[in-house]
Interface confidence: low
Amino acid sequence: RKIPKVGHTFFQKPESCPPVPGGSMKLDIGIINENQRVSMSRNIESRSTSPWNYTVTWDPNRYPSEVVQAQCRNLGCINAQGKEDISMNSVPIQQETLVVRRKHQGCSVSFQLEKVLVTVGCTCVTPVIHHVQ
Amino acid sequence: RKIPKVGHTFFQKPESCPPVPGGSMKLDIGIINENQRVSMSRNIESRSTSPWNYTVTWDPNRYPSEVVQAQCRNLGCINAQGKEDISMNSVPIQQETLVVRRKHQGCSVSFQLEKVLVTVGCTCVTPVIHHVQ
């Protein structure tokens, strides 16, 4: 799903207040709901009729440092006999997410939000058939 | 996928530097890759064999203000005849994501990261049959 553009409102102070100095804002330390966790069914990536693999990208100057990307294993979907059925399609499910980028020059450390596109998994769909004239 | 705990390292300055004052950090305005966007197949939520609906939560003090959650429509999966097959299961695919929470008291505005659990879509899986002793 899409993250809207920031525009110039969310991170601004009310109009009656002095502007934010130096184009930066105050980010409080700590993460709300940090202990909240994913509770997905086990091994769905291999049990799915549109199975996928995971790859992990690592960047120590990003939070979270690990971002996991899914790749659909097949073009078609897996039928009850365990065979690929190419009359159906495995398609990726994508999500826009925010990460935090750390930038430092010596002792001056600042952070910036970054939008990252994550493929979370795959689903099996009926293909759209185009009749070409 | 899971976002790790922040611990006490990512948002800290190097040990040789003076500590961050007042438990807050400098967040630069603007979002890197803001124009990056999801390019998913059209209407996959209704074409999927594990179809889902979307609901939107809205919070003006969160960025993004809109968070979209998916809910699987069925317990089973939709077969080639368009009927629900309860020998298979529709299961949610979840993703931990970050949002920014805005907190203000008068002209003092600060921001804090918040972890949100988003159900992005659903996939069709072979159920795990447990023979409970």
Epitope: S39, S41 | L75, I86, P127
Partner: nanobody
């Protein structure tokens, strides 16, 4: 967040019956498969029964099958454990739990994200 509150636990004689309700509040109750677990003194928590989101599908541990029935009333946001032919070995604290996903692995304790505080059932001989 989902809050779960069990009730109905008490002292009952062997061969007797009990009905344990578990009332849910918070996020939409119908979004969750629900389960009952129990923990006897000095033992690990164990799976008793579970019911799917739709209420059409239920699973039971072998030691309660035929004696216990799980049901749900979505209008009342309540799941019930109906217990009959109770035995002294059924003595335990009974916990209600909700899952945030469904895949047929009813008895896997780690799949249950939300838990009640428990209600004590004591079966005397």
């Amino acid at each position: 967040e989902v809050q779960l509150v069990e009730s109905g636990g008490r002292l009952v004689q062997a061969g007797g019956s009990l009905r344990l309700p578990c009332a849910a509040s918070g996020r939409t109750f119908t979004s969750y498969p629900m389960g009952w677990f129990r923990q006897a003194p000095g033992k690990e928590r164990e799976f008793v029964a579970a019911i799917s989101m739709s209420g059409d599908d239920a699973a039971y541990a072998d030691f309660v099958r035929g004696r216990f029935t799980i049901s749900r009333d979505d209008a009342r946001n309540t799941v019930y454990l109906h217990m009959t032919s109770l035995k002294p070995e059924d003595t335990a604290v009974y916990y209600c739990a909700a899952r945030t996903s469904y895949d047929g692995t009813y008895d896997y304790i780690d799949d249950y994200s939300y838990w009640g505080q428990g209600t004590q059932v004591t079966v005397s001989s």
